[in-house]
């Protein structure tokens, strides 16, 4: 067990041109707060997937009113650290999302309004117990500077907070094979001993004597690969007799969601859908009012002036859930026409149109030939979102500006000589050949060797030669 700590140093305009406008004004004073979401591993998970390592909300910063005419400075920040406790081992690699929120303090109906100013995300490697790591992230024109670290809660120590420290039994040194616990030199490592025989590759323990299996392994010592072939369901019957179990209890066994939350399994963990009035990874945060800012992603909080009356989050387009915590995949409806690429920017949908199409949904087929001139008597032909020129004889290229050499492709067969001509080309055939391209041999009796009629057709019938 341990705590991930995040210290925000500054939030303000980034370097370079296009400084953002201040988020607050004399008419609309505001204050900032931050939300951090942690997930294990280096996964490129969507912003709305559960914060499986934990999440935290900062306090509100000081109220800020923009000075008229002044550029947006670094904005005043909340005091203190954001702390995300973790119960299990520190994973070493993690993904983070840090959101900067603005609370508008004007005369809002139903209390203050929240909107998301910036969201930064990243993936990092971090050993627990190490020094503060400094970071700078940019989101649009904003820049966020922060530091973070992971520290173990006693008696846990080590880079993953899985080793335990105990006070020394003897004043001078630790027992055989046990090292002093840096930085607690007066304590000794007490290694966490898993069940004897527990697979070092596929098993682990969080309590002495146990052997918990990584996903895909089962058995008393986590040595048996999970086979779903004989299972009744993907996790198999809940029985010790089958070899089908995903090892250990399922993530939703015993329902980890508090306060009437419903649990659904995810590939790595679980997700709680919380009833109104509760939120958090396990719906453990209760007595929430609008003053606590429970609506994420710019949701508007209404009601809930006291802990006993529920609040309601009115979600902006693109978000849903009782706390507006889930992003709607609006691109799945394929709103962009004519092969346009859909981009969900959160606050809006954008369609990136293919050449030849335009409009918010790429619905307009541009006149490909408008303003396009084909030189040297060529004519413009529309099609497929691009224009092309059909060039007059003797000319080629995209706009018919290049003089074509009709003989360049050696069109005359059987050694015929090619001559460029104003109307195209002329082939002077070698002896024994005839035709526009010298393609037919001439027989001694003077008949040309045209292809024979296919079986079943009499000479003279209409034919198509292949």
């Amino acid at each position: 067990a341990g705590v991930f700590e995040l210290q925000i140093h500054s939030f303000g305009p980034g370097p370079g041109p296009g400084a953002p406008r201040s988020p607050c004004s004399a008419r609309l004073p505001c204050r900032l707060f931050f939300r951090v979401c942690l997930k294990p591993g280096l996964s490129e998970e969507a912003a709305e997937s559960p914060c499986a390592l934990g999440a935290a909300l900062s306090a509100r910063g000081p109220v800020y009113t923009e000075q008229p005419g002044a550029p947006a400075p670094d904005l005043p920040l909340p005091d203190g650290l954001l702390q995300v406790p973790f119960r299990d081992a520190w994973p070493g690699t993690f993904s983070f999302i840090i959101e900067t929120w603005r609370e508008e303090l004007g005369d809002q109906i139903g209390g203050p309004a929240w909107s998301l100013l910036a969201r930064v995300a990243g993936r990092r490697r971090l050993a627990a117990g190490g020094p503060w790591a400094r970071d700078i992230q940019r989101a649009g024109a904003w820049e966020l500077r922060f530091s973070y670290r992971a520290r173990c809660e006693p008696p846990a120590v080590g880079t993953a907070c899985t080793r335990l420290c105990r006070p020394r039994s003897a004043p001078s040194r630790c027992g055989p094979g046990l090292r002093p616990c840096a930085p607690l030199e007066d304590e000794c490592e007490a290694p966490l001993v898993c069940r004897a025989g527990c697979s070092p590759e596929h098993g682990f323990c969080e309590q002495p004597g146990e052997c918990r299996c990584l996903e895909g392994w089962t058995g008393p010592l986590c040595t048996v690969p999970v086979s779903t072939s004989s299972c009744l369901s993907p996790r198999g019957p809940s029985s010790a007799t089958t070899g089908c179990l995903v090892p250990g209890p399922g993530p939703c066994d015993g329902n980890p969601c508090a306060n009437g939350g419903s649990c659904s399994e995810t590939p790595r963990s679980f997700e709680c859908t919380c009833p109104r009035g509760f939120y958090g990874l396990r719906c453990e945060v209760s007595g929430v009012t609008c003053a606590d800012g429970p609506c994420f992603n710019g949701g508007l909080c209404v009601g809930g002036a006291d802990p006993d009356s529920a609040y309601i989050c009115h979600c902006p387009p693109g978000f849903q859930g009782s706390n507006c915590e889930k992003r709607v995949d609006r691109c799945s409806l394929q709103p962009c026409r004519n092969g346009g690429l859909c981009l969900d920017l959160g606050h809006a949908l954008r369609c990136r149109c293919r050449a030849g199409f335009a409009g918010p949904r790429c619905e307009h087929d541009l006149d490909d030939c408008a303003g396009r001139a084909c030189a040297n008597g060529g004519t413009c032909v529309e099609g497929g979102g691009a224009h092309r020129c059909s060039c007059a004889l003797g000319f080629g290229g995209r706009d018919c500006r290049e003089r074509a050499d009709p003989c360049a492709a050696r069109p005359c067969a059987h050694g015929g000589r090619c001559y460029a001509h104003f109307s195209g080309l002329v082939c002077a055939c070698a002896p024994g050949y005839m035709g526009a391209r010298c393609e037919f041999p001439v027989h001694p009796d003077g008949a040309s060797a045209l292809p024979a009629a296919p079986p079943g057709l009499r000479p003279g019938d209409p034919q198509r030669y292949l």
């Epitope: 001993v193 069940r195 004897a196 025989g197 309590q207 002495p208 004597g209 146990e210 089962t218 058995g219 008393p220 010592l221 040595t223 048996v224 010790a240 007799t241 070899g243 179990l245």
Partner: antibody, heavy 119, light 107 residues
């Protein structure tokens, strides 16, 4: 040294329940699985299931689900197995055993408890 | 469930002999096999773990071998106190299962 002391034998009526105890000494009780094994003459040894006293985590042999249930009291270093709805098929010697510290398997065994079910 | 088959219910031997008790698993259990000795009226005693390692205090005339599905307990220079029933056990899969036992008796 490690010791497992089991409760004495019992003569039980069909349909009744019995609770067998296994008191551990000489080691950290919470940190090692206690295993329960049934032995009937001519039937060899049958594994009933196990409990890790520190966490209360249990695993049962499907065959004994509904018949056996395990508990552990870390304050008295005692593990318990309750057998319910007894029939003559439950007449047997029941052993508790402890999983090894560095070596897997059951290096330590209790002396056994004879349960006899008879009308 | 994994079935541990001890094909010989009884084996006859003499003091000083070398005897091998066999056990066959119905599917691969790696080396997650233990051997136990039980004398009448006593609790089982652990002899071998991980197919071939002796528990502490077990005389070195007891040796275990095998992996996968075929396992053997060999007693070299049999002593009179070795006359007992021997059980194999797999602890690779739940439920843990034992063989039916092989009784070692004097010729």
């Amino acid at each position: 040294q490690v010791q497992l002391q089991q409760s004495g034998g019992d003569l039980m009526k069909p349909g009744a329940s019995v609770k067998i105890s296994c008191k551990a000494a000489g080691y950290t009780f919470s940190n090692y699985y206690i295993e329960w094994v049934k032995q009937r003459p001519g039937h060899g040894l049958e594994w009933i299931g196990e409990i890790l006293p520190g966490s209360g985590s249990t695993t049962y042999n499907e065959k004994f689900k509904g018949k056996a249930s395990f508990t552990a009291d870390t304050s008295s270093n005692t593990a318990y197995m309750q057998l319910s709805s007894l029939t003559s098929e439950d007449s047997a010697v029941y052993y508790c055993a402890r999983w090894g510290a560095r070596e897997p398997g059951f290096p330590y065994w209790g002396q056994g408890t004879l349960v006899t079910v008879s009308a | 469930d994994i079935v541990m088959t001890q094909s010989q219910k009884f084996m006859s031997t003499s003091v000083g002999d070398r005897v091998s008790v066999t056990c066959k698993a119905s599917q691969n259990v790696g080396t997650n096999v233990a051997w136990y000795q039980q004398k009448p009226g006593q609790s089982p005693k652990a002899l071998i773990y991980s197919a071939s390692y002796r528990y502490s205090g077990v005389p070195d005339r007891f040796t275990g071998s095998g992996s996968g599905t075929d396992f053997t307990l060999t007693i070299s220079n049999v002593q009179s106190e070795d006359l007992a029933e021997y059980f194999c056990q797999q602890y690779n899969n739940y439920p843990l299962t034992f063989g039916a036992g092989t009784k070692l008796e004097l010729k």
